[in-house]
């Protein structure tokens, strides 16, 4: 195999692989016909100038997870055929300005997870064929204007997890072919108007986990092909009217973990491909009529962990396909009887951890397919007669942690609960709060001795009319829905803390998270 170095393996197809901590210097001599060279998990700290002179046919060079801290300016001389270069997961702090001048046919350049503190303006000036540039996980405090100007073929750029606090509005102006731009995990507080205007082919924009406070009204107006927009875990307090109006292809939008106080009518849409919208962990206090009216394909709407005290009767207009609505952990005291009227396909509604004092008898009137209702931890003393009677598919109803008043008015609810005890689950049953004589007793099995007929609840009633729920959840509820934030230690944890592995930490949700 043309002199394969002893510490490497070489295949007859010109593939060379050198791995292991015992390698402390560049192996040599390398076979002259090598087309792919991988140097992985070694203790190589330096790349001299002369090591690749004799392997001009090299197409792919992968030097990852080494101790590489120093690269000589002419290290890649004579590698004119190189298409793919990865120097990821090393200890590079600086790159010689002319390091890449002889590899002008590169298509992918991976520099992620190093310690780069700056990029020279001319660093990438010869890369007209470059398609992918990964700079994730460095220490770049700012991106010089003009540094990407020659990357006219670039389709994927990852600048995530660096330290930069601002962007020049012209930094991306020549990247008309860019499709994926990842800027997450930086310290951006403001994005100048026009920053993304040249990116007409952009399909994914990741801005999550920055410190963005405001969005310019027309920030995304030239990005009509955008399909994924991640804005979660920022400091956004306001969504300008029309901010999302030019995004007809959007199918993923995350806004959780911001400081949103209100939503203007129609701010979302039209977005016919959006199926799930996460707005939890904001400061939203009220929802106006038609807040989501353009989202006619939305299936999941998560508004938990806000400060909602008022929901307009028409707030959910247009959400004809909504299946899951999460309103838990807010400040709701009252709900209008028509608030859910347009939600004909709703299956799960979570209203736990609010301050609801009563529910209108008609609140679920048009929502015949409801399967789970979470009402625990509110201020409910009773419920209207027949409120659940038409809900034939209801298989999970949580009513515990409410101050139930077990006087004669509770009898209809008591009777219904006895007949439908299986729907209450087995974890926690509703308990009487007053009068004092029955405080702490289960509302389901209490002997109700009021003026009027006495009702003794059977321990395990036979419920002949109970629907077949063999395929329904028994006790897991809407409370384990899609909430995707860092963990907290309170009772309503939103996420298991999951360390990122290979840049791919999962959306973690816990049963307790109540989403």
């Amino acid at each position: 195999y043309y002199g394969c170095p002893s510490e490497c393996t070489c295949s007859r197809a010109s593939q060379v692989e050198c791995t292991g901590a015992q390698i402390v210097a560049m192996p040599s001599p390398l076979p002259w016909n090598a087309m792919s060279l991988q140097i992985l998990n070694t203790h190589i700290t330096e790349l001299p100038e002369d090591k690749f002179l004799n392997i001009s046919a090299l197409i792919a060079l992968k030097m990852e997870k080494n101790e590489l801290a120093n690269i000589m300016p002419g290290a890649f001389r004579n590698l004119g055929s190189l298409r793919h270069l990865s120097l990821a997961n090393n200890k590079l702090k600086n790159l010689p300005v002319r390091l890449f001048q002889d590899v002008n046919n590169l298509e992918t350049l991976l520099l992620s997870n190093n310690q780069l503190v700056q990029i020279q303006p001319a660093q990438f000036s010869q890369f007209s064929n470059l398609k992918e540039l990964q700079l994730y996980g460095n220490n770049l405090e700012y991106i010089p204007e003009g540094v990407f100007d020659h990357l006219v073929g670039l389709t994927k750029l990852n600048l995530g997890n660096n330290g930069f606090t601002h962007l020049s509005p012209r930094v991306f102006q020549h990247l008309g072919n860019l499709q994926v731009l990842r800027l997450y995990e930086n310290r951006l507080s403001d994005i100048p108007m026009g920053t993304f205007d040249a990116l007409g082919n952009l399909q994914e924009l990741a801005l999550q986990e920055n410190q963005i406070g405001t969005l310019s009204p027309g920030l995304f107006h030239n990005n009509r092909n955008l399909q994924r927009l991640y804005l979660s875990n920022n400091h956004i307090s306001h969504l300008p009217p029309g901010i999302f109006m030019q995004l007809p292809h959007l199918n993923k939008l995350t806004l959780f973990g911001n400081s949103l106080k209100e939503l203007s009518p129609g701010v979302f849409g039209p977005m016919p491909n959006l199926r799930e919208l996460w707005l939890y962990n904001n400061h939203i206090t009220s929802l106006p009529d038609n807040a989501f009216s353009h989202l006619n394909q939305l299936q999941v709407l998560i508004l938990s962990h806000n400060q909602l005290s008022y929901i307009s009767p028409g707030a959910f207009n247009g959400l004809t396909n909504l299946r899951e609505l999460s309103l838990h952990t807010n400040a709701l005291q009252d709900l209008d009887g028509n608030v859910f009227r347009s939600l004909a396909n709703l299956r799960n509604v979570s209203l736990q951890n609010n301050r609801l004092r009563q529910l209108p008898g008609s609140i679920f009137a048009n929502v015949n397919g409801l399967m789970t209702i979470q009402l625990q931890n509110n201020n409910l003393e009773n419920l209207p007669l027949g409120i659940f009677d038409h809900l034939g598919n209801l298989c999970e109803l949580r009513l515990y942690d409410n101050p139930w008043r077990c006087d004669s008015n509770i009898l209809p609810l008591h009777d219904w609960l006895i007949l439908n005890r299986a729907r209450l689950g087995t974890d926690t049953l509703p308990v009487c709060s007053s009068p004092a004589s029955v405080r702490g007793q289960s509302l389901v099995i209490i002997n109700v001795n009021f003026p009027g007929p006495s009702v003794q609840g059977p321990e395990t009633p036979e419920v002949s009319s109970y629907p077949d729920t063999s395929s329904y959840p028994d006790s897991t509820s809407i409370s384990s829905t899609t909430e995707i934030t860092r963990s907290t230690d309170d009772d309503y944890t939103d996420l298991n803390t999951i360390e990122p592995i290979d840049d791919r930490n999962t959306w973690g949700m816990t049963d307790a998270q109540s989403g």
Epitope: Q179, Q203, A206, R323, N348, T482, W507, M509, T510, D511
Partner: antibody
């Protein structure tokens, strides 16, 4: 270890029904979206249906819409596929898979079951 | 729906060869593409996600590239266990369509 095990497959007549189950273990089931994928004999893979971790969002291929129903029971770490009005062209190995995704570019069916065979024939 | 096509549908190669499989989407899917390997009688196994990222535990001879509509899977040096079928799949939007597959056979 992380594992998915399908069951419920078998021989059924056209127009009949079948209910597939998938038992998950080794990971927090309620953290993940789940999916069904099928593979007809000597054919390629076909995505059938996906369900969000809470069960709120549900997606179907056009070829099964209105006939198949996906559901999950997070308390039992189980995924289900109720198949009604079965046709000969539904004959396939049915796999359940964990759909893992995040906002950093990870999108994949990263864990698969071994599959269960469904044969629709008179 | 997004239609995924793969080429070639089958290819013959030898142990040690470098092979490239192409996957094309009918419309732009950014980099929301995964590659799977399936051995006969077994479930598929994830190789590549995000078009070019190697799944943990997958040998480094596998690599992916591309974004938008054109994607490639490259096996830098075929081993005997690599002579199986490979599928691409898009995750950009529902339905999450697969390519028809490419069978890699021994020459």
């Amino acid at each position: 270890q992380v594992q998915l095990v399908e069951s419920g497959g078998g021989l059924v007549k056209p127009g009949g029904s079948l209910r597939l189950s998938c038992a998950a273990s080794g990971f927090t089931f309620s953290d993940y979206y789940m999916s069904w994928i099928r593979q007809a004999p000597r054919k390629g893979l076909e995505w059938v249906s996906s369900i969000s971790n809470s069960g709120g969002a549900i997606y179907y291929a056009d070829s099964v819409k209105g006939r198949f129903s996906i559901s999950r029971d997070n308390a039992k770490n189980s995924l289900y596929l109720q198949m009604n009005s079965l046709r000969a062209e539904d004959t396939a190995v049915y796999y359940c898979a964990r759909y893992n995704w995040n906002d950093r570019g990870y999108d994949a069916f990263d864990i698969w079951g071994q599959g269960t065979m469904v044969t629709v024939s008179s | 729906d997004i239609v995924m096509t793969q080429s070639p549908s089958s290819l013959s190669a030898s142990v040690g060869d470098r092979v490239t499989i192409t996957c094309r989407a009918s419309q732009g899917i950014s980099s929301a593409l995964a590659w799977y390997q399936q051995k006969p009688g077994k479930a598929p196994k994830i190789l590549i996600y995000d078009a070019s990222s190697l799944e943990s535990g997958v040998p480094s001879r596998f690599s992916g590239s591309g974004s938008g509509t054109d994607f490639t899977l490259t096996i830098s040096s075929l081993l005997p266990e690599d002579f199986v079928t490979y599928y691409c799949q898009q995750f950009n939007s529902y339905p999450h369509t697969f390519g028809p597959g490419t069978k890699v056979e021994i020459k």
